[in-house]
Amino acid sequence: HTAAQDNCTCPTNKMTVCSPDGPGGRCQCRALGSGMAVDCSTLTSKCLLLKARMSAPKNARTLVRPSEHALVDNDGLYDPDCDPEGRFKARQCNQTSVCWCVNSVGVRRTDKGDLSLRCDELVRTHHILIDLRHRPTAGAFNHSDLDAELRRLFRERYRLHPKFVAAVHYEQPTIQIELRQNTSQKAAGDVDIGDAAYYFERDIKGESLFQGRGGLDLRVRGEPLQVERTLIYYLDEIPPKFSMKRLTA
């Protein structure tokens, strides 16, 4: 390896191809799948990451598609359409012309329809509840230590502004992390809570998206915090529109 190649990598996204051919020899990285340029000083959008993931060889995928009736998105894998900024397009369709509307984190928020389905706007997910169950430990974690460690993690690893971590709840063995971010609160350059939650989810599953960094080693006062189950709930600024059939299923 040479200095140029060694230094031309994307620390925040390993699903990229980088080369030092930008203006003035700047290292430029493009997301796999979409070929879109990414800003490696911050998190890559979930849409581009999903697209990159779907472009990877099929045997690289280890997770199965969640149940049709799941109320949470357990890494619901599909090849999304992203806009020029890397956000999810409000309407997503598959190869068989089945379409549905998604929220800003790419989770379906309507029944599936055909190509005539209209999704007028991308509805923002403003509240994310990350529900974790940790493996048994000798005793419960100290709540304030746990709170501090998780807030530090979101601030330092995911670069999420502390004001967007609304609360950390703990009732052994369940930990809940609440992320809140209204459209009006999100300033230019702020990491999106949806992107931070996705990076965290992949970290917890041992599938870190960061380049060359070790996996996530969560410790509370030196005690390893090992997660055995993760559920993520998404709340949108406008409630989803599912038919009664879906709601009673």
């Epitope: 140029a4 030092p20 051919d21 003035g24 020899g25 700047r26």
Partner: antibody, heavy 116, light 107 residues
């Protein structure tokens, strides 16, 4: 150490073409971009274009689009800049420079004089 | 194209003086700015890249600062070998553009 050695001075007639070479050594040629910059007598620096030998991608200053051609010969680690339809205002010192993240190593320069 | 306005175009200073040269971009350039020194009849030499990173081997009296659109090259204590012309370059986007240059002369 990184070295860029350019071809010698040229005197050209208006309307003709000139091809300046830039031989690189001391690093892997395909790993860095080469930029071309010119400087008219007593004037400032003017960017002409950039080539990345690793993938033969290039970018040109619109001002030189169609007149300048950048190429790279990976077998000899040499970059070339050809400028056609020369006019008197093209009289300048032409520099090649290896760039990485804005940090540049420069060739010694090639004086091209266009005169009838 | 991004315009780079360098000032002053020339200045006279004495050995030991603190010298400041500024470069203003017509739009934000994300700190993708370099500074070069050029002496008569010679090729330019890199001093600073990424707005504030000193090139290996360049004396620590040279420093770069600024962000957004306004950038500064400072020579903390001018030495005899520093009399030259200085250029800034933006490499945020194509085409790359240089400032007009600042000639530092002996007072």
């Amino acid at each position: 150490q990184v070295q860029l050695v350019q071809s010698g001075a040229e005197v050209k007639k208006p309307g003709s073409s000139v091809k300046v070479s830039c031989k690189a050594s001391g690093y892997r040629f395909t790993d860095y971009v080469i930029n071309w910059v010119r400087q008219a007598p007593g004037q400032g620096l003017e960017w002409m274009g950039q080539i990345y030998p690793g993938s033969d991608t290039f970018h040109y200053n619109q001002k030189f689009q169609g007149r300048a051609t950048l190429t790279a010969d990976k077998s000899t680690n040499t970059a070339y800049m050809e400028l056609s339809s020369l006019r008197s205002e093209d009289t300048a010192v032409y520099y090649c420079a290896r760039f990485f993240e804005g940090l540049a190593y420069w060739g010694q320069g090639t004086l091209v004089t266009v005169s009838s | 194209d991004i315009q780079m306005t360098q000032s002053p175009s020339s200045l006279s200073a004495s050995v030991g003086d603190r010298v400041t040269i500024t470069c203003k971009a017509s739009q934000g350039i994300n700190n993708y700015l370099s500074w070069y020194q050029q002496k008569p009849g010679k090729a330019p030499k890199s001093l600073i890249y990424r707005a504030n990173r000193l090139v290996d081997g360049v004396p620590s009296r040279f420093s770069g600062s600024g962000s957004g659109t306004d950038f500064t090259l400072t020579i903390s204590s001018l030495q005899p070998e520093d009399f030259a012309t200085y250029y800034c370059l933006q490499y945020d986007e194509f085409p790359l553009t240089f400032g007009g240059g600042t000639k530092v002369e002996i007072k």
